[in-house]
Every structure is written in structure tokens, then in C-alpha cells.
Interface confidence: medium
């Protein structure tokens, strides 16, 4: 950065190099050049010329004045004219840096996915601050009163390994930057009530001409866990409001969920599980689509970015296009 | 009724490569797993990979892990193996086999159905 230049002087800001945004600054600049009393002494931010609120202090010494200041980041630089020199000489350069105070971390949320090893904590970390924050989680053994704490930037994934310390746990989230500092409330955990089932997965649709058609969207999960709720929700892509069907399932085969729809419509599907009773469900899976016949059965088929099986009906279409769901993050 | 075809076995140096392919029957979407297996004279059929066919996951047995690789074409219902530096200890007849119930495991008994075996030697 600018600050790793040899100075020949002194640059200094004011209240501090790092200050909330929108406030008044003001930065000094003092040259100390050999054989050298400034004519001029100009600043520049980020290799630009400043022409206004420049004020001669004496002869080594400028002041600029800046009136809210609202940029995140800014280089700045000064340099004197010296009698004799055809060019200006640099004295000196500074990062300076503003944003907020960081807000109190709410939302606490701690959950461990099936087969992930670890638990991972996550929090509404409030407005934008601007500047480096940094946030320590605090977990507390609730039967050892043995407390860990650690350092991350964002979220933080904790080994399972290392929650030695019985199932029950408090965990509370301390932000700091240079402006501020601020905690959250505790969160109190039981390791078994925030395991999150394996994703849940539509492969296939097909929809069956009978009497009246039907339409079959066959499903999965690799959860071992055995009491698991779930919801599959569905519209017609031309709708807004989703309809919701919920299950009780156990996953040791694929599940064959029946719905009787309208013909010729596009319709799109999602899934989401938990374990029954707990506190915290999967996110929605990727969109699955599938277009109900006019008369003729359909199958539409859709793994990952693989493709998955479909029966040899007369219509059969395969959909390997991977489209994220509107609300992933979607946990609570 | 769930039926499987390997094909694609034969003979081959050791170093060198073979696409092993099972093509299924239509019923066999309802299976939950597919995988493949081996068993070499005088031994036990041993898993080498499965695959979850909803979601494309894999599981390899650790002596052909990195050089094998199990995927599927859900448009032709065929589960493929991929089989690169093959060594004289990969020889065996290699069964095609799905999973109607249970976990993506490498054991043999969770299979219900199998296929007839394609062979594949691999000389020094």
C-alpha cells in the first residue's frame, strides 16, 4: 500500500486514520525535505489533485479539511514544491479508512449438517461497516463450563470433534472493529436438536394417464436419520402463491409422492426436510420442473449435474440444468 | 421386472483402460442405488463403486480409488465404470447390481438385483 513509501516528512489525520463515515476530517501534511522550504505543499486522494479547503499552517505544514466524509477507502499523498526542482516532491502517503461501528450480531443460529462434522454458526451481522471486522464466537460447555472461542470474519464452522463437552452449549457472538465493539444475546444449544437431514432430492416426475391423471415426483435423501419431516411445495410456474404438502417419511427407499394436477401446465417442485420435531429445516432444493401432458404420460428427470433414471414411457425428457431455489439460506 | 446388461469387459494390459456399462430396464428407476462389483476365482464378490442415482453420489472401494470412476446417462438408463491403470489384481468378472432399499454401501447383501457379470483381464 501507499504506506510502505519512504517519506521525507509526516502525514497524519485527524480524529484518526480510521473514523465512522460521514464525519469531518482534517489531514496534516509537514514536510522535512533537505535544502528544501515548500513553496506549495499539495494533497492528492487517490492520485487526484485537491484544489479546495487547503490551508498553509506554516511553512513546513498544510492542513486539508474534509466535511462528511463518505468514501470507505481513500489513498492520499502529499508533496511539496521545492525551489529549484522542476518536480513536486513527495513527503509522505496514508490509507485512510471510514465506516461504522459494527451492530449488535442477532439472529444467532447454530446448526450441524448430516455428515458435514461440524457445526456451523451464522449470524445477522446488521449494516455494512465498511472497515475490518472481526468476530469472535463463544462456545460454553454447559456441563463443564469449559468456553472456546473462535476468530473468523463471517460464519465459522466448528469440528464436532471439538465440542468435548456433553451435548449442551451456550454461544454468543462478540463483533469488534476499530470503531466499536458489540455481543449478542446467548443462544443455548443441545447438539441433537440442530442436526440438519442430509438434502433432500427430486430425480424424476412422471405423470400417468388414467381416468384421471396423476402425477408421481419420486424423491430422496442419504439421511440415516430415521424420524424426518418433510414438505414438498409446488405451483404452476405462472402462479405466486406455492401449495404445500407435508410428509412424515423414512428414507431407506425412494419416496413416490402422488399429486393430481392440470393438464398442458408447467409446473415446478421443491422439497425440504427436518427431523421431525427439531428446530431447523433443510433449504429448499433446487427448482425441479416438469410440464403435465395434454393426454400422453410424461417423465421428466433431474439429478444435480447428473442425469438420473427415467422409465421407458412413450414422452420422456431429461432436465440436468442445476437452478438454485429462491430462499436457500432459508433454515428457521 | 429389473434387468441388467453388462457389457464392455475383455482382456488388457496392466496400465491400460476399459469402460465397463450396465444398461438398465425401465423398472429400475425405482432402484435407490447402483453399483458395481467384482469377484475373482476363489473369492468373495467385493463392492468397487455405487452411485446414488437422485443426487450422482459416489463411493469407491479404497483399492480403486483415483483410478476408477463410476457416473450414469439417465437418458440411456446406463451406469458406467471407467476403469484406468488397471492392474492384474483388478481381474475378475465384474457384476452390475441395484439397490432397491438401504444405504450407498460396498456390500453385496443390500443388492437385489444383479446383472450376469462381464469379464475383464488384465495381464503383466
Known amino acids: 500500500g501507499i504506506t510502505n513509501i519512504n517519506c521525507s516528512g509526516h502525514i497524519w489525520v485527524e480524529p484518526a486514520t480510521i473514523f465512522k463515515m460521514g464525519m469531518n476530517i482534517s489531514i496534516y501534511c509537514q514536510a522535512a525535505i533537505k535544502n528544501c522550504q515548500p513553496r506549495k505543499l499539495h494533497f492528492y486522494k487517490n492520485g487526484i489533485k485537491e484544489r479546495f479547503q487547503i490551508t498553509r499552517i506554516n511553512k513546513t505544514t498544510a492542513r486539508l479539511w474534509y466535511k462528511n466524509f463518505l468514501e470507505p477507502h481513500a489513498s492520499m499523498y502529499c508533496t511539496a514544491e521545492c525551489p529549484k526542482h522542476f518536480q513536486e516532491t513527495l513527503i509522505c502517503g496514508k490509507d485512510i479508512s471510514s465506516g461504522y461501528p459494527p451492530d449488535i450480531p442477532d439472529e444467532v443460529t447454530c446448526v450441524i449438517y448430516e455428515y458435514s462434522g461440524n457445526m456451523t454458526c451464522t449470524w445477522n451481522a446488521g449494516k455494512l461497516t465498511y472497515i475490518d471486522t472481526k468476530y469472535v464466537v463463544h462456545v460454553k460447555s454447559l456441563e463443564t463450563e469449559e468456553e472456546q472461542q473462535y476468530l473468523t470474519s463471517s460464519y465459522i464452522n466448528i469440528s464436532t470433534d471439538s465440542l468435548q463437552g456433553g451435548k449442551k452449549y451456550l454461544v454468543w457472538v462478540q463483533a469488534a472493529n476499530a470503531l466499536g465493539m458489540e455481543e449478542s444475546k446467548q443462544l443455548q444449544i443441545h447438539l441433537d436438536d440442530i442436526v440438519i437431514p442430509s438434502a433432500a432430492v427430486i430425480s424424476r416426475a412422471e405423470t400417468i394417464n388414467a381416468t384421471v391423471p396423476k402425477t408421481i415426483i419420486y424423491w430422496d435423501s442419504q439421511t440415516t436419520i430415521e424420524k424426518v419431516s418433510c414438505e414438498m411445495r409446488y405451483k404452476a410456474t405462472t402462479n405466486q402463491t406455492w401449495n404445500v404438502k407435508e410428509f412424515d417419511t423414512n428414507f431407506t427407499y425412494v419416496q413416490q409422492s402422488e399429486f393430481y394436477l392440470e393438464p398442458n401446465i408447467k409446473y415446478v417442485f421443491q422439497v425440504r426436510c427436518q427431523e421431525t420435531g427439531k428446530r431447523y429445516w433443510q433449504p429448499w432444493s433446487s427448482l425441479f420442473f416438469h410440464k403435465t401432458p395434454e393426454t400422453v404420460p410424461q417423465v421428466t428427470s433431474k439429478a444435480f449435474q447428473h442425469d438420473t433414471w427415467n422409465s421407458g414411457l412413450t414422452v420422456a425428457s431429461i432436465s440436468t440444468g442445476h437452478l438454485t431455489s429462491d430462499n436457500r439460506g432459508d433454515i428457521g | 421386472q429389473v434387468q441388467l446388461q453388462e457389457s464392455g469387459g475383455g482382456s488388457v494390459q496392466a496400465g491400460g483402460s476399459l469402460r465397463l456399462s450396465c444398461a438398465a430396464s425401465?423398472?429400475?428407476?425405482?432402484?435407490?442405488?447402483m453399483g458395481w462389483f467384482r469377484q475373482a476365482p476363489g473369492k468373495e464378490r467385493e463392492g468397487v463403486a455405487t452411485i446414488w442415482p437422485a443426487g450422482g453420489n459416489t463411493v469407491y472401494a479404497d483399492s480403486v480409488k483415483g483410478r476408477f470412476t463410476i457416473s450414469q446417462d439417465g437418458a440411456k438408463k446406463t451406469v458406467y465404470l471407467q476403469m484406468n491403470s488397471l492392474k492384474p489384481e483388478d481381474t475378475a468378472m465384474y457384476y452390475c447390481a441395484a439397490a432397491k432399499y438401504g444405504g450407498t454401501s460396498l456390500a453385496p447383501y443390500t443388492y437385489n438385483y444383479w446383472g450376469q457379470g462381464t469379464q475383464v483381464t488384465v495381464s503383466s
Open positions: 425401465p423398472g429400475t428407476y425405482t432402484s435407490r442405488y
